[in-house]
């Protein structure tokens, strides 16, 4: 039938950060090509990445249409140069992906401290509100727009002279913390979605320390 050397894809894996979502699979193709289809549980299949020799397919455009939906993808294998050929049952070989719900499963990207400002013994730390590829009314939504109060940030802060890290939490993008006068502090933030069961935390932001250019100091 011309499919004797065609193998089904395997190890289908979703790789997703801040809703940028790619489906990866194996094996690297030898004399075969792949096409990917994606669907919601109740929707129709949509084909993407037609007859590709890649082992990944960017499905971001599809999943951002409704990040709270659950998606299923499948990868079809075709003989190279003979994509009309089918398997023994009259269908091309294919393998299903695990289900994927972007809102619950996309990894939280590394946050960035936008700025910090000291006024006396208070420091205001602001986290950058990262833009996602989720659109509403033709504009890209930020992470906060998408997750709302489900998204919190944990601030780790410590005196430059010590290692113990105090914590603070916010469900905005700003922290207001008390600091000791005359001490320099360092800061790092972590995004958290407490309502999740998996992928609850982001990696920590790069560390920012007082006395460096991102910060501002005002004595009152």
């Amino acid at each position: 039938s011309g499919t004797t050397n065609t193998v089904a894809a395997y190890n289908l894996t979703w790789k997703s950060t801040n809703f940028k979502t790619i489906l990866e699979w194996e094996p690297k193709p030898v004399n075969q090509v792949y096409t990917v289809q994606i669907s919601t549980k109740s929707g129709d299949w949509k084909s993407k990445c037609f007859y590709t020799t890649d082992t990944e397919c960017d499905l971001t455009d599809e999943i951002v249409k409704d990040v709270k939906q659950t998606y299923l993808a499948r990868v079809f294998s075709y003989p190279a140069g003979n994509v009309e050929s089918t398997g023994s049952a009259g269908e091309p070989l294919y393998e299903n992906s695990p289900e994927f719900t972007p809102y619950l499963e996309t990894n939280l990207g590394q946050p960035t401290i936008q700025s910090f400002e000291q006024v006396g013994t208070k420091v205001n730390v602001t986290v950058e509100d990262e833009r996602t590829l989720v659109r509403r009314n033709n504009t890209f939504l930020s992470l906060r727009d998408v997750f709302g109060k489900d998204l919190i940030y944990t601030l780790y802060y410590w005196k430059s002279s010590s290692s113990g890290k105090k914590t603070a939490k916010t469900n905005t993008n700003e922290f207001l913390i008390d600091v000791d006068k005359g001490e320099n502090y360092c800061f790092s933030v972590q995004a958290v979605i407490p309502s999740r069961t998996v992928n609850r935390k982001s990696t920590d932001s790069p560390v920012e320390c007082m006395g460096q250019e991102k910060g501002e100091f005002r004595e009152i």
Partner: antibody, heavy 121, light 107 residues
Amino acid sequence: EVQLVESGGGLVQPGGSLRLSCAASGFTLTGYWIHWVRQAPGKGLEWVGYIDPYNGATYYADSVKGRFTISADTSKNTAYLQMNSLRAEDTAVYYCARADYYYVDEYWDYWGQGTLVTVSS
Amino acid sequence: DIQMTQSPSSLSASVGDRVTITCRASQDVNTAVAWYQQKPGKAPKLLIYSASFLYSGVPSRFSGSRSGTDFTLTISSLQPEDFATYYCQQHYTTPPTFGQGTKVEIK
């Protein structure tokens, strides 16, 4: 089923060391925060310190700073409390507890059964 | 550090009584207060979180409230299994701190 099981307590001489373990099951340690709390005989609860197993961040109560170290082995899903230079006043039942958030408010929903540490000559 | 001043330190009550325990924070802690119940030889158990939310599986006779920096745990009708020690805890700032505890005894 979520569970925290402590072990490693016992009798130790002043100045000695002990390592307590807190083995977690039913959840992945890295998704949460682990606190250690102690309770001296007939007394109230005293916070000892915490670890974020995801990034290794720690902080300690002044009473144990420089003597106690909290760590985690994520491959074993276990947190540890290394106690050095032990004093009689460290005698207590030691608990580990899992911290989670409701929005920004933290709560400690699961606790270990406790392990008794007695510092005496 | 934030102090949590809990009162009374002990109380005697009868089954069916309404019991109120209070905690005062030394500074603003927003709603970052939890209440725990502890029985002799056992680990503490979470009752109330975020000042007023009843933890899953906890009987509805337990409730929590906040007024500024004052926090209250109320048991509407004391049951035999409620005789225990109760602790408030703030986690608004590091380090988290506990109240001294309130022992609820049988009258």
